[in-house]
């Protein structure tokens, strides 16, 4: 760091009171998954137990936008989250034990880039340190995966089918079902980040209904079966 305070001694070549931070050069993860950004540090203040703030920022050191911030009261091991961008960042490490490791949920391709950890001692040992190097997060594209397919009761004793898939880039969804035409109009719902949902609003015939998800990396399929026995509504999947 910009070196800490030196004791008032005339000793020559005293070690500069410096911090250090250990971060890996790179972390790789797939879109839609979670990633852990490890960060540990050492500091020159022996047994600091005062208030502290843990910060992660993106883009560039010292000046990039903060994506996560938490503060711990004196003596407390609990770091209260004050900022978690889009609610997707969570501290895994314990800053009191020199660990600032961060978990990032629901990764998107846009999360790729450099992340920098920082710790601030805001008590008597007024000091702070930030990693200049940072850790590079590489988020790779993901082939489609169907995470949920279901048949639900609809209006007027009818049934509807829902299909939710994830992938990066977000996949296009299509439903196909019993004849005639073998293909049915699907309502493509709003996606949440890397997830998309398509609804087939009215299942008019018994049989197999297939949801297909496709993007530039591949395709995935899943099916549900609708059977109605003795005129009573029911499903078998």
């Amino acid at each position: 760091d910009a070196s800490g305070d030196l004791l008032n001694t005339e000793a020559h070549s005293a070690p500069a009171q410096r911090w250090s931070m250990q971060v890996p050069a790179e972390v790789n993860a797939e879109a839609g998954d979670a990633a852990v950004l490890p960060c540990t540090f050492t500091h020159p203040h022996r047994h600091y137990d005062g208030p502290l703030t843990a910060i992660w920022r993106s883009g560039e050191p010292y000046a990039g936008p903060q994506v996560f911030r938490c503060t711990a009261a004196p003596g407390s091991e609990l770091c209260q989250t004050a900022l978690s961008l889009h609610g997707r960042f969570r501290l895994l490490g314990n800053p009191r034990r020199n660990d600032l490791s961060l978990r990032v949920e629901r990764l998107a391709l846009a999360d790729s880039g450099r992340y920098f950890c920082r710790v601030e001692f805001t008590g008597d040992a007024h000091d702070r340190y930030e990693s200049r190097h940072g850790v590079r997060l590489r988020v790779t594209a993901a082939a489609p995966r169907i995470v949920n397919i279901s048949v639900l009761p609809g209006p007027a004793h009818a049934f509807r089918a829902l299909c939710t898939a994830e992938g990066e880039p977000p996949p296009a969804l299509a439903w196909s079902g019993p004849a005639p035409g073998n293909s049915s109009a699907a309502l493509q719902g709003q996606g949440h980040g890397y997830q998309v949902t398509a609804e087939l609003p009215a299942l008019t015939r018994d049989g197999r209904y297939t949801c297909t998800a496709a993007n530039s990396l591949g395709r995935a399929e899943a099916s549900v079966y609708l059977f109605r026995f003795h005129g009573a509504p029911g499903t078998s999947t």
């Epitope: 760091d1 070196s3 800490g4 305070d5 030196l6 020559h12 005293a14 410096r18 911090w19 050492t42």
Partner: antibody, heavy 118, light 112 residues
Framework: DVQLQESGPGLVKPSQSLSLTCTVT?????????WNWIRQFPGNKLEWMGY???????TYKPTLKSRISITRDTSKNQFFLQLNSVTTEDSATYYC???????????WGQGTTLTVTS | DVLMTQTPLSLPVSLGDHASISCRSS???????????LDWYLQKPGQSPKLLIY???NRFSGVPDRFSGSGSGTDFTLKISRVEAEDLGVYYC?????????FGGGTKLEIK
């Protein structure tokens, strides 16, 4: 962009005190880092003199400790070097520089030349 | 104090040549936290020094990759793979592991 600019008298008489100012723009000296004074003697030898940290604490080169003082004016975003009892040996170009967390001087002023002569 | 000794004092080169500058410290500058705070600076005539390499081998932002640093303990080297006209000037090593921080005496890179 971060910029540092030294200013001073240029000429000082032996046994007097030297006062130099470093004005920082583009960054608050109370935000982070250590703010250093470094001098370069004729013949190009560089000497680190000391710093004042963002927190206000100071560290000096032990051989200068008896006559050096580094202070700051946070309202003007300036920090200062005072060197007492100067001799001709203190004639040099004086630089201010920002030291970041990795012990490196990433921003320097352009330097101000000081001559000690009677 | 930690004495930093640079060799050679002067290094005449032709443009396009490789150049190597050595820096030796009088004691180890491995800090107790595991880092070695050894930097290299270039000073061109009439200018303030500019940072090239920090912590032995890390190129500072904007520094061309023809500059590289290496070493450990007490022996360090700055290499320039293909000297260009803009590389001419005085090179200094610097240690920030121990107080007082100290600079090497400088190596002047000049045209042969």
């Amino acid at each position: 962009d971060v910029q540092l600019q030294e200013s001073g008298p240029g000429l000082v008489k032996p046994s007097q005190s030297l006062s130099l100012t470093c004005t920082v723009t583009g960054y608050s000296i109370t935000s982070d880092f250590a703010w250093n004074w470094i001098r370069q003697f004729p013949g190009n030898k560089l000497e680190w003199m000391g710093y004042i940290r963002f927190s206000g604490s100071t560290t000096y080169k032990p051989t200068l400790k008896s006559r050096i003082s580094i202070t700051r004016d946070t309202s003007k975003n300036q920090f200062f070097l005072q060197l007492n009892s100067v001799t001709t040996e203190d004639s040099a170009t004086y630089y201010c520089a920002r030291e970041d967390y990795d012990g490196l001087f990433d921003y320097w002023g352009q330097g101000t030349t000081l001559t000690v002569t009677s | 104090d930690v004495l930093m000794t640079q060799t050679p004092l002067s290094l005449p080169v032709s443009l396009g040549d490789h150049a190597s500058i050595s820096c030796r410290s009088s004691q180890t500058i491995l800090h107790s936290n595991g880092n070695t705070y050894l930097d290299w600076y270039l000073q061109k005539p009439g200018q303030s020094p500019k940072l090239l390499i920090y912590k032995v081998s890390n190129r500072f932002s904007g520094v061309p990759d023809r500059f590289s640093g290496s070493g450990s303990g007490t022996d360090f080297t700055l290499k320039i793979s293909r000297v260009e006209a803009e590389d001419l000037g005085v090179y200094y090593c610097f240690q920030g592991s121990h107080v007082p921080y100290t600079f090497g005496g400088g190596t002047k890179l000049e045209i042969k």
